[in-house]
Amino acid sequence: FGISGKHFITVTTFTSAGNIGEDGTLSCTFEPDIKLNGIVIQWLKEGIKGLVHEFKEGKDDLSQQHEMFRGRTAVFADQVVVGNASLRLKNVQLTDAGTYTCYIRTSKGKGNANLEYKTGAFSMPEINVDYNASSESLRCEAPRWFPQPTVAWASQVDQGANFSEVSNTSFELNSENVTMKVVSVLYNVTINNTYSCMIENDIAKATGDIKVTDSEVKRRSQLQLLNSGP
């Protein structure tokens, strides 16, 4: 058998994104080791002296933790023995973005992997029919985005059409002076058609769909993080 620390173990991380003001997770897995007391997890951040988080002998050791992470980090303690070294980050800040290293030492050996953590704001859009307008129009709203996204409209009937001339998009700074509310209005819409409002920045892409008929309004929205994965 290998002498502790002499062998390399596989450590895998996944690029991920954090939504500022909410909880985030920096994903990291490693070859499991049933000896919990022999597992050391260290999270480091490029450009930061001190540790983001350290977990060893079955508990947190925050004696060397950098103050910018104080009170905001935790591992999934009950999942460490099965190889989960992912880090929970409470109340993600814009400044949490950067390159992180997940370093693992177990009785089988040691290993590390880097991940790129992006931070921003992203939220689901909601489309409603704007009955107050002089002509039938649609209003697409999403409460929190950062950096400023692009907004585009599309329709099922007029595929490939450019709606920039018949839409108006505004960005309103939220009270915390970082994120913005996105509002886009599409004018001169026709019934029995499905319209899509697409909001995108370098972190996430969100789409809201609405189908308006004489008898009903159907809505659907989805959000996907970009460049997430190994």
Partner: antibody, heavy 121, light 107 residues
């Protein structure tokens, strides 16, 4: 031992502002979150928000974002909550509580004794 | 915003085991909701009992335990004592805010 000592009862006029305090002793103030909670008879407990002392990091319940402002002074180990534009709806008992966020658990453990606020003309 | 529901009142006898539950309107309660249980005694005396679903706050008697039962968070008092007569509140975390339940009066 750990203690959270809150300021005394307040009687305020509608439209006024009030600032209540929560003094922490017996632990490292900057390592724990301070949570603020509202209790009104028949309304149970309502979470107002939280602050991590020593940082500018706060989280507010959307309902209280305009109403409440949290600050903390690490030199005196005291957290503050200011409530503005008071109305009768703000009449309640307000609590501060310590919240620990760590790998082994996430818990509210110690609570202050509460500050009673009455808003009346 | 989510609604967290608890039994309004439960009755037990000394020595019995009683379970209080906490349901979320958004679906099953998971460990990511960090379910907390807090006890309130007369004169606004609050004490934290359980955090992170199943971790007892240091100093809390072993008769108090937390778990997930089905799609709900649960607080079980094994061998209830007279001094356990109180209001019990659960709180669930929803990614960036806490929501408290209405409380269970245990008699």
């Amino acid at each position: 031992q750990v203690q959270l000592q809150q300021s005394g009862a307040e009687l305020m006029k509608p439209g006024a502002s009030v600032k209540m305090s929560c003094k922490a002793t017996g632990y490292t103030f900057s390592s724990y979150w301070i949570e603020w909670v509202k209790q009104r008879p028949g309304h149970g407990l309502e979470w107002i928000g939280e602050i991590l002392p020593g940082t500018s990091i706060t989280t507010y319940n959307a309902k209280f974002k305009v109403k409440a402002t949290f600050t903390a002074d690490t030199s005196s180990n005291t957290a503050y909550m200011q409530l503005s534009s008071l109305t009768s709806e703000d009449s309640a008992v307000y609590f501060c509580a310590r919240y620990y966020f760590g790998s082994s658990s996430f818990y509210f453990d110690y609570w202050g004794q509460g500050t009673s606020l009455t808003v009346s003309s | 915003q989510a609604v967290v529901t608890q039994e309004s009142a439960l009755t037990t006898s000394p020595g019995d085991t009683v379970t209080l539950t906490c349901r979320s309107s958004t679906g099953a309660v998971t460990t990511s909701n960090y379910a907390n249980w807090v006890q309130e005694k007369p004169d606004h005396l609050f004490t934290g009992l359980i955090g992170g679903t199943n971790n007892r706050v240091p100093g809390v008697p072993a008769r108090f335990s937390g778990s997930l039962i089905g799609d709900k968070a649960a607080l079980t008092i094994t061998g209830a004592q007279t001094e356990d007569e109180a209001m019990y509140f659960c709180a669930l975390w929803y990614n960036n805010h806490w929501v408290f339940g209405g409380g269970t009066k245990l008699e």
